[in-house]
């Protein structure tokens, strides 16, 4: 059983990935980012079903993509750079999903925009989040 | 129809500099990236970098960050890359390249015929 | 930055052969969410700009002959040409443009026997 510590890092990481991609979004946002529409054309996939931490799979098989549609912007638009701040999130994401179960994402048929993926996944966290508190 | 049309070949002095354009027609080259790659015989193909012509905004890698500028002017439709402390390694042909699409997944599908840059003293 | 390893160097052929050309990438290429392959093979003749053949690994560019196939997943992919004519000469070079910086394979001379 998950104990009150354990619990509570968990929440401090998420709260820490919630953050990260809040910070993304804003970014991408922002109203001097010249490179939205252009953004807006990538392609991003979400998981059918997104309810508990093993789902963040889903989340970290796109990370590499979202790396590259961050090199696109400016990056004055984020305090890191779009590498930096991918690893970030990838650690988190892995201490959070745990690497001893192998979990087998499954993709929903339709795609989204960043600004769609961005706030699914920030939609996960804050969920989680509640759950915990 | 989509073409890139590169200007003539260029013969260089060691540590002199050469300025080379891109000139895009059938498509506003605002709409897509333009990428520079290096064409040596022994070496291959290596990518320079692209440029946002709709910005202005570069990214180059590592190896060529102090040796190219890349730079666009929308009016002409046309991409620049300036080449500077030129040494006999730079002797190559330097290509540019569109996507196949605009949505960054795509690999270069149109090129220009290439420009040819000597350095020889 | 992903490296490509391309083998053969050279490879000399007769008419009418069939060739295999391997290209193995340091990383996968495969993104999960559409299955796809962001590796990509060019024929470059001398003298000649690349010619976009295969993209996403396996699917044809428009007006290439059916005779050019790619397959493979993850980090190892072939370029096979059955068939081969005398026009097939050239250079044949993968790329990968999954991960920045993009970066080619060092290329395959396909040269006559």
């Known amino acids: 059983a998950p104990t009150s510590s354990s619990t509570k890092k968990t929440q401090l990481q998420l709260e820490h990935l919630l953050l990260d991609l809040q910070m993304i979004l804003n970014g991408i946002n922002n109203y001097k980012n010249p490179k939205l529409t252009r953004m807006l054309t990538f392609k991003f996939y979400m998981p059918k079903k997104a309810t508990e931490l093993k789902h963040l799979q889903c989340l970290e098989e796109e990370l590499k993509p979202l790396e590259e549609v961050l090199n696109l912007a400016q990056s004055k638009n984020f305090h890191l750079r779009p590498r930096d701040l991918i690893s970030n999130i990838n650690v988190i994401v892995l201490e959070l999903k745990g690497s001893e179960t192998t979990f087998m994402c499954e993709y929903a048929d339709e795609t989204a925009t960043i600004v769609e993926f961005l706030n699914r996944w920030i939609t996960f966290c804050q969920s989680i989040i509640s759950t915990l508190t | 129809e989509i073409q890139l049309q590169q200007s003539g070949p260029e013969l260089r002095r060691p540590g002199s500099s050469v300025k080379l354009s891109c000139k895009a027609s059938g498509y506003n080259i605002t709409d897509y990236l333009i990428h520079w790659v290096r064409h040596r015989p022994e070496h291959g193909l290596e990518w320079i970098g692209w440029?946002?012509?709709?910005?202005?905004?570069?990214r180059y890698a590592q190896k060529f960050q102090s040796k190219a500028t890349l730079t666009a002017d929308t009016s002409s439709n046309a991409a620049y890359m300036q080449l500077s402390s030129l040494t006999p390694e730079d002797t190559a042909t330097y290509f540019c390249?569109?996507?196949?699409?605009?949505?960054?997944?795509?690999?270069?599908?149109?090129w220009g015929q290439g420009t040819l840059v000597t350095v020889s003293s | 930055d992903i490296v490509m390893t391309q083998s053969p160097f050279s490879l000399a052929v007769s008419e009418g052969e069939m060739v295999t050309i391997n290209c193995k990438s340091s990383q996968s290429l495969l993104r999960s969410g559409n299955q796809k392959n962001y590796l990509a093979w060019y024929q470059q003749k001398p003298g000649q700009s690349p010619k976009l053949l295969i993209y996403y690994a396996s699917t044809g560019q428009s007006g290439v002959p059916d005779r050019f196939i790619g397959s493979g997943s993850g980090t190892d992919f072939t370029l096979t040409i059955s068939d081969v004519q005398a026009e097939d000469l050239a250079d044949y070079y993968c790329l990968q443009h999954y991960i920045s910086p993009p970066t080619f394979g060092a290329g395959t001379k396909l040269e006559l026997k």
């Open positions: 440029i946002d012509p709709e910005d202005g905004e570069t």
């Open positions: 390249a569109r996507s196949l699409d605009s949505t960054y997944d795509y690999p270069f599908a149109y």
